[in-house]
Amino acid sequence: IVGGTNSSWGEWPWQVSLQVKLTAQRHLCGGSLIGHQWVLTAAHCFDGLPLQDVWRIYSGILNLSDITKDTPFSQIKEIIIHQNYKVSEGNHDIALIKLQAPLNYTEFQKPICLPSKGDTSTIYTNCWVTGWGFSKEKGEIQNILQKVNIPLVTNEECQKAYADAKIAQAMVCAGYKEGGKDACKGDSGGPLVCKHNGMWRLVGITSWGEGCARREQPGVYTKVAEYMDWILEKTQSSDGKAQMQSPA
């Protein structure tokens, strides 16, 4: 996160850290807990990496430096990458992770509500992006979970900023015209959440952008509302029944 500040315990209890252990172990992506056994993240987190064994998912964590060999983590039972995702293209950058064992909810580890299907009418004015990613373009993973308040921008405005790319309906953009605050590498897969009527909802999944926090280059996020059918289909067909945190 560029231009962010430290988060506090229990502030974003749905935030998870996706870590990979090949030779060394390292944080690679964020993710959002959306049910006892389900995490929503970005498909591109898995580019070039095995879909087995090597992944460790840490929930209820604020400071990555607190993680030791004894820190409990979840393992992956199944990774479901959107069938239309293509490497190095921005579209359909969404993936579901089914955990091997269900997680108990606590004050520091509980799910984020999902938006309504095709939610286009809600005007979100209080949106935040969180993660342990770089604090500058060529930076390093941060220890303490960072948060930053960023306004949504219209897809039309976003398309002007990215003339060479297609900003699809299933994307949502957020950023300041002057730059300075944004997600960055290592934040991918993590949540863009917005508070509306007193409730936090998962509006976007951190996906891509031109650099980080550049002027007139907003961050691009996968628009979760556009994938509600897919999320429900995949979680129900795997579970027999959905265990998602839907809006009241």
Partner: antibody, heavy 122, light 106 residues
């Protein structure tokens, strides 16, 4: 100790085919992206192709697209390069390498085989 | 896919610092690796992620990368450093190598 051993090179006529193999040992083969890089005599390194750990995604240099096919058999710890419609300009030493890749840090190859020579000539 | 440009040759006196450059459009936005290749041998990784050095590589090797140019520096150059050096970057699923630089120790 990581070991990569290429085989299958040799002399082939233009338009012919050849299949290269790379036997891997000393690491968990199914966890790593694998790459083929070639080097024409007296020339520099040229990337040819790479393949993701599961084999689910493959990528090719424009110069070989449609003619070469990369594949892997994780149960045999072996990487392959099927080369069809070979041309004189494909003459090179072909190296197999183990790639380290993720979306944050990009790609680099930390271990290389000794190479196998492919000569395309009539 | 953008090209990476290296000088064909660099000469240095023993004990001096050799600097080999690699230039490309917005190269500073990408992460660069460097490989050393001695005659008749396979390439060997000497720098990755711009500045990081594998444990088996001498501390005399270092790297930097900003704007449009990445640089491999070899301090206290020795005769055994004579080799071809290649830079490499990754861009939108494409692996790109520089043309290579022959380092000669005078």
């Amino acid at each position: 100790e990581v070991q990569l051993l290429e085989s299958g090179g040799g002399l082939v006529q233009p338009g012919g085919s050849l299949r290269l193999s790379c036997a891997a040992s000393g690491f968990t083969f199914s966890w790593y992206t694998m790459v083929w890089v070639r080097q024409a005599p007296g020339k520099g390194l040229e990337w040819v192709s790479y393949i993701y750990p599961s084999g689910g995604a493959t990528f090719y240099a424009d110069s070989v697209k449609g003619r070469f096919t990369i594949s892997r058999d994780n149960s045999k710890n072996t990487l392959y390069l099927q080369m069809n419609s070979l041309r004189a300009e494909d003459t090179a030493v072909y190296y197999c390498a183990m790639g380290s890749y993720d979306y944050i840090w990009g790609f680099y190859s930390d271990h290389w085989g000794q190479g196998t020579l492919v000569t395309v000539s009539s | 896919q953008s090209a990476l440009t290296q000088p064909p040759t660099v000469s240095v006196s023993p004990g001096q610092t050799a600097r080999i450059t690699c230039s490309g459009n917005k190269l500073g936005d990408k992460y660069v690796a460097w490989y050393q290749q001695k005659p008749g041998q396979s390439p060997m990784l000497v720098i990755y992620q711009d500045t990081k050095r594998p444990s088996r590589v001498s501390e005399r090797f270092s790297g930097s990368n900003s704007a449009n140019t990445a640089t491999l520096s070899i301090s206290g150059t020795q005769a055994l450093d004579e080799a071809d050096y290649y830079c490499q970057a990754w861009d939108s699923s494409i692996v790109i190598f520089g043309g290579g630089t022959r380092l000669t120790v005078l």
